[in-house]
């Protein structure tokens, strides 16, 4: 009778085992082992027992001891079970960002590992078991569905294999996949709100504000603001679940025309975008042209107003005839026109909006000098010893210099308060002089003596 020891062995893959083949007869003709495994005989005195070292055991095997005794041949098998932990434990790749409310399928693949009867696959969130299943198939695959919640943000999902050899007197061998860190997010279906000027003038600055509510996690939201190809650099302010991105936008003549203003909010693997058109326009103030800004009284003056080719102008409130970018008026310069403002107002329609620009020029009319009765009376009668202020106003542009002299030497103190004396009486020659010429006027001062009262 042939016997084998041990009859059952569990050993690590690639390991070695000693197998003893024995026979009950004293003088066997033959005693040995049949196995494809590399073997060494570990010699022992005697004929009825042989010990073999079987090495590099890669898979389950059933070496067979045999003996040939006088009463016949017999065999005995030993069962070698190889154990090894899986070579690959992997969660199928998933986008790290997942929207809240989505059903997320976790798929764990396990390659290798034996004995399969003792191999279990566990899907976990942190340390919480989501699913536990025996490893079946090659590769073994275990899946579970998770409804993504906001509080899953930052959670680690992993897959663990458990090769439980404790019933065989060994230990529990665990292998864990690389964790998958879930980033959850909420990006509302509503597009971001974009507030900006609809029209923007060349060489000016505008402010653009993009905002959105109901985001999670708001700090992870990326905001991209752009005007055409120009990326804007916004200052972003965050609320609990909202943000507001404010940026200044400067435009130049190269930007003129219709430009696309975009605000894109990217969160996770989703984005929301708002588009708006901004019309960049160039509209210089209209030009007011005077034949000459300074003319002499009586000169014919042409006032022209010229504006943007598409503008409509009014000159001193009078629309151009025909309505268009040019207007003009003709006048003969009078003293009353001195300091007169000629105002040109131009209106341009840009993207449905009316833009107004004004330009004003002042006309200077050179005239005079003038001395008339109204402003310089020719006769004053004042009581002696009274307080009086002689008044004589000369007109003209430029303002004339005025001097009133009696006998060519004694001045009348124009505009000054004086005590009337006999000396003041007499006829004064008032002379107004400017670059435009000179005029004279006689002014007589009469002093009433008290004895005449």
């Amino acid at each position: 009778q042939t016997s084998v020891s041990p009859s059952k062995v569990i050993l690590p893959r690639g390991g070695s085992v000693l197998v003893t083949c024995s026979t009950s007869c004293d003088q066997p003709k033959l005693l040995g082992i049949e196995t494809p495994l590399p073997k060494k005989e570990l010699l022992l005195p005697g004929n009825n027992r042989k010990v073999y070292e079987l090495s590099n055991v890669q898979e389950d095997s059933q070496p067979m001891c045999y003996s040939n005794c006088p009463d016949g041949q017999s065999t005995a098998k030993t069962f070698l079970t190889v154990y090894w932990t899986p070579e690959r434990v992997e969660l199928a790749p998933l986008p790290s960002w997942q929207p809240v409310g989505k059903n997320l399928t976790l798929r764990c693949q396990v390659e290798g590992g034996a004995p399969r009867a003792n191999l279990t696959v566990v899907l976990l969130r942190g340390e919480k078991e989501l699913k536990r299943e025996p490893a079946v198939g090659e590769p073994a695959e275990v899946t579970t569905t998770v409804l993504v919640r906001r509080d899953h943000h930052g959670a680690n999902f992993s897959c663990r294999t458990e090769l439980d050899l404790r019933p065989q007197g060994l230990e529990l061998f665990e292998n864990t996949s690389a964790p998958y860190q879930l980033q959850t997010f909420v990006l509302p279906a509503t597009p971001p709100q974009l507030v900006s000027p609809r029209v923007l003038e060349v060489d000016t600055q505008g402010t653009v504000v993009c905002s959105l509510d109901g985001l999670f996690p708001v700090s992870e939201a990326q905001v991209h603001l752009a005007l055409g190809d120009q990326r804007l650099n916004p200052t972003v302010t965050y609320g609990n679940d909202s943000f507001s991105a404010k940026a200044s936008v400067s435009v130049t003549a190269e930007d003129e025309g219709t430009q696309r203003l975009t605000c894109a909010v990217i969160l996770g693997n989703q984005s929301q975008e708002t588009l708006q058109t901004v019309t960049i326009y160039s509209f210089p103030a209209p030009n007011v042209i005077l034949t000459k800004p300074e003319v002499s009284e009586g000169t014919e003056v042409t006032v022209k107003c010229e504006a943007h080719p598409r503008a409509k102008v009014t000159l001193n409130g009078v629309p151009a005839q025909p309505l268009g970018p040019r207007a003009q008026l003709l006048l003969k310069a009078t003293p009353e026109d001195n300091g007169r403002s000629f105002s040109c107002s131009a209106t341009l329609e840009v993207a449905g909006q009316l833009i107004h620009k004004n330009q004003t020029r002042e006309l200077r009319v050179l005239y005079g000098p003038r001395l008339d009765e109204r402003d310089c009376p020719g006769n004053w009668t004042w009581p002696e010893n009274s307080q009086q202020t002689p008044m004589c106003q000369a007109w003209g542009n430029p303002l004339p210099e005025l001097k009133c002299l009696k006998d060519g030497t004694f001045p009348l103190p124009i505009g000054e308060s004086v005590t009337v004396t006999r000396d003041l009486e007499g006829t004064y020659l008032c002379r107004a002089r400017s670059t435009q010429g000179e005029v004279t006027r006689k002014v007589t001062v009469n002093v009433l003596s008290p004895r005449y009262e």
Partner: antibody, heavy 116, light 107 residues
Framework: EVQLVESGGGLVQPGGSLRLSCAAS????????IHWVRQAPGKGLEWVAR????????IYADSVKGRFTISSDDSKNTAYLQMNSLRAEDTAVYYC?????????WGQGTLVTVSS | DIQMTQSPSSLSASVGDRVTITCRAS??????LHWYQQKPGKAPKLLIY???QSISGVPSRFSGSGSGTDFTLTISSLQPEDFATYYC?????????FGQGTKVEIK
């Protein structure tokens, strides 16, 4: 019948070399392992080296590593121990023995004396 | 290296006595422990392998026991031919190491 016979021992000066042989009969050395074990005069047993004649894998005790080399010749069913840079503390009876974990069969031993 | 310590180093006993020799390993060696008998001028002889496995041709009065770190060789009834030195040896890890020996002498 299993038999192991050592030869090649003798007197050698410190720093000298010696080659011991172990001729096996009654079994094929490729089917097992061959070891050398030594015993200094009046002392205990010390394992020295092992060879797997099937693939020439070898293992040595730290005390002889780099100085001794174990080898085998399948055609002669013989194992060898080449001893170089011999020291006085290498003086011992050298036994060749078989098996992998225990030593069931031993040769009669060969004495190596290292002395000037 | 695993250190093997035998006790006692020597003992005196009479024919018919029960003799026990112990061997302690510096770390666990499972059952990878073997016993040898050596007489002066002779090569050692294997008595027990794997702590307790008997050898064909070795008298049944020799038995072994133990596992882990503590092992025992017992001679149930000492015979005149048993006066010799006994060694234990571990084969759990390289290098294989022997105990220092226990000499059994006639009382």
């Amino acid at each position: 019948e299993v038999q192991l016979v050592e030869s090649g021992g003798g007197l050698v000066q410190p720093g000298g070399s010696l080659r011991l042989s172990c001729a096996a009969s009654g079994f094929n050395i490729k089917d097992t392992y061959i070891h050398w074990v030594r015993q200094a005069p009046g002392k205990g047993l010390e394992w020295v080296a092992r060879i797997d004649p099937a693939n020439d894998n070898t293992i040595y005790a730290d005390s002889v590593k780099g100085r001794f080399t174990i080898s085998s010749d399948d055609s002669k069913n013989t194992a060898y121990l080449q001893m170089n840079s011999l020291r006085a503390e290498d003086t011992a009876v050298y036994y060749c023995t078989d098996s992998g974990y225990w030593f069931a069969y031993w040769g009669q031993g060969t004495l190596v004396t290292v002395s000037s | 290296d695993i250190q093997m310590t035998q006790s006692p180093s020597s003992l005196s006993a009479s024919v018919g006595d029960r003799v026990t020799i112990t061997c302690r390993a510096s770390q666990s060696i499972s059952n990878n422990l073997h016993w040898y008998q050596q007489k002066p001028g002779k090569a050692p002889k294997l008595l027990i392998y794997h702590a307790s496995q008997s050898i064909s041709g070795v008298p049944s009065r020799f038995s072994g026991s133990g596992s882990g770190t503590d092992f025992t060789l017992t001679i149930s009834s000492l015979q005149p031919e048993d006066f010799a030195t006994y060694y234990c040896q571990q084969s759990n890890s390289w290098p294989y190491t022997f105990g220092q020996g226990t000499k059994v002498e006639i009382k």
